[in-house]
C-alpha cells in the first residue's frame, strides 16, 4: 500500500517553504502547494500559463477525487462534464449537454428524450391505460327509471402518464346510447310532483318514456317523440342498434 520508493523522484522547486498557507503541507513560491495536510485533496489549478497547486477539503466542480495511500488527488473530468465518477463516467454534464450512460451529448439518441429537469436522456414513456371498467347503469337525467332510451358510460384509469415524446393517452371515458325495459319509477324516484305519472295506454308511435299528464301537454303542446313519423322512428331504431359511441374525456 506504500508508494514504491524506487521510481519516485520528487523534483522540489528551489523555493520550497514549510510556512505554507491554508491546508498546504509543503509549498513553493512559484507552484503554490506541493503537498497537502491529511484528508485534504491536492488539485492543480491553471492560472494563465502556469499550474498552481491548491489544497481543498473536496474536489471542485469538474474534478473527481482519488484517495491514494500517500495523497488525495483531484483529477479533471472530461471537458463537457461537471461531476464524474472517473475519466470514463460522467454523472452530471455541463449546461447544454445531456447525460447518457456516463457520456455528455448535445442531443439524445434515437428512442430517448431529453429530461430538461435532470439534464439526462431518458426512455420515452408511452401512455398506459387500464382495461375498461364495466358500463354504468343506463340513465337519463340521472334517473334509471321511467324511460326507454338513455345513456351509459364506462371509464378506465391512466396507469402511466406519457413523457414529452410519448404517445398521448387514449380516451378514458366512453358514453353510448342505451335502451332499458320500461320500468315504473318508485315513489322515492319520482321527479317533479305529478310529472312522471304514466298514461294508461301510450299511443302507437309514442316512446315508452314516462310522459307528462294532459295538463302539462296543453302547455307544452307535443313532446318531441310524438312529433316523429314512422320513418324517423325506423331511423332511430337503426341508430340504437349501432349504439353510437361519443367520447368525452381525452388526456
Amino acid at each position: 500500500q506504500n508508494a514504491s520508493r524506487g521510481r519516485r523522484q520528487r523534483r522540489m522547486h528551489p523555493n520550497v517553504s514549510q510556512g505554507c498557507q491554508g491546508g498546504c503541507a509543503t509549498c513553493s513560491d512559484y507552484n503554490g502547494c506541493l503537498s497537502c495536510k491529511p484528508r485534504l485533496f491536492f488539485a492543480l489549478e491553471r492560472i494563465g500559463m502556469k499550474q498552481i497547486g491548491v489544497c481543498l477539503s473536496s474536489c471542485p466542480s469538474g474534478y473527481y477525487g482519488t484517495r491514494y495511500p500517500d495523497i488525495n488527488k483531484c483529477t479533471k473530468c472530461k471537458a463537457d462534464c461537471d461531476t464524474c465518477f472517473n475519466k470514463n463516467f460522467c454523472t452530471k454534464c455541463k449546461s447544454g449537454f445531456y447525460l447518457h450512460l456516463g457520456k455528455c451529448l448535445d442531443n439524445c439518441p434515437e428512442g430517448l428524450e431529453a429530461n430538461n429537469h435532470t439534464m439526462e436522456c431518458v426512455s420515452i414513456v408511452h401512455c398506459e391505460v387500464s382495461e375498461w371498467n364495466p358500463w354504468s347503469p343506463c340513465t337519463k337525467k340521472g334517473k334509471t327509471c321511467g324511460f326507454k332510451r338513455g345513456t351509459e358510460t364506462r371509464v378506465r384509469e391512466i396507469i402511466q402518464h406519457p413523457s414529452a415524446k410519448g404517445n398521448l393517452c387514449p380516451p378514458t371515458n366512453e358514453t353510448r346510447k342505451c335502451t332499458v325495459q320500461r320500468k315504473k319509477c318508485q315513489k322515492g324516484e319520482r321527479g317533479k310532483k305529478g310529472r312522471e305519472r304514466k298514461r294508461k295506454k301510450p299511443n302507437k308511435g309514442e316512446s315508452k318514456e314516462a310522459i307528462p299528464d294532459s295538463k302539462s301537454l296543453e302547455s307544452s303542446k307535443e313532446i318531441p317523440e310524438q312529433r316523429e313519423n314512422k320513418q324517423q322512428q325506423k331511423k332511430r331504431k337503426v341508430q340504437d342498434k349501432q349504439k353510437s359511441v361519443s367520447v368525452s374525456t381525452v388526456h
Epitope: R7, T66, R67, Y68, N86, F89
Partner: antibody
Framework: EVQLVESGGGVVQPGRSLRLSCAAS????????MAWVRQAPGKGLEWVAT????????YFGDSVRGRFTISRDNSKNTLYLQMNSLRAEDTAVYYC?????????WGQGTMVTVSS | DIQMTQSPSSLSASVGDRVTITCLVS??????FVWYQQKPGKAPKLLIY???RLQDGVPSRFSGSGSGTDFTLTISSLQPEDFATYYC?????????FGQGTKLEIK
Amino acid sequence: EVQLVESGGGVVQPGRSLRLSCAASGFTFSDYDMAWVRQAPGKGLEWVATIIYDGSRAYFGDSVRGRFTISRDNSKNTLYLQMNSLRAEDTAVYYCTAHDRSFDYWGQGTMVTVSS
Amino acid sequence: DIQMTQSPSSLSASVGDRVTITCLVSEDISNDFVWYQQKPGKAPKLLIYAASRLQDGVPSRFSGSGSGTDFTLTISSLQPEDFATYYCQQSYKYPPTFGQGTKLEIK
C-alpha cells in the same frame, strides 16, 4: 475497441521469478493508472498492485509488497509485473486492468501456477 | 482497509425471478461503489458504477442502489445469461477491496 492482452504466465517453482506483460490498445494508455488484479482458482478477486499514469508512484497489496514490482512503458503502451520469491498462494489468474477508482477495462488474464 | 461483506455467497433462482444481492461496507463510502459480473473462464465486467449508474450495454433489468454502508444489486427478471458470479468493490480509497462474490445458479 479497448484491448488488454496479458502474457508471461506459466508454471514456476516456489522461490522463483516470473515477469508478466500486458499490451494495451484502443485507449490513451498514458492517461490511466494501471493495475494487476488476481483470482486464485475458485476464489474471489484480489487487488495486487497499481501504478499511476506517469509511472512515478506505485502501490501494492499486503500479500505481495516487497516481492512484486509494477512498472510501465508508456511509449510501448505496456504494463509489467515482476514477481519474485513466488509462493504456492500466488497461484492465480492475473488480470491486467485500467484502474481509475473502478476497474474499467480488463484483459482476458494469464494463469500463473506456483508448484514444485 | 475497508471490509466488504457480500451476501448471500450463493443463490439458486429461476429465469424470471427477481434477485437481490447485498454488500455491507465497514465504513461510510458515500456512493463510491461498483458492481461487476463474471462468467466462468472470463474476466470480470463492470456493471454498475457510482452505486446506481448502469454501464453502457448493461440491460435495464439490472439496478443498483444504496449509499454510505449498505448497497444492493437487483436483477428484476432473471435471464439465462445472468447466471454468473457478482462482485462488489469499494472505490472510496486505497487499497481497493472486493466483496467475496455471489454465485448465482439456476434452480
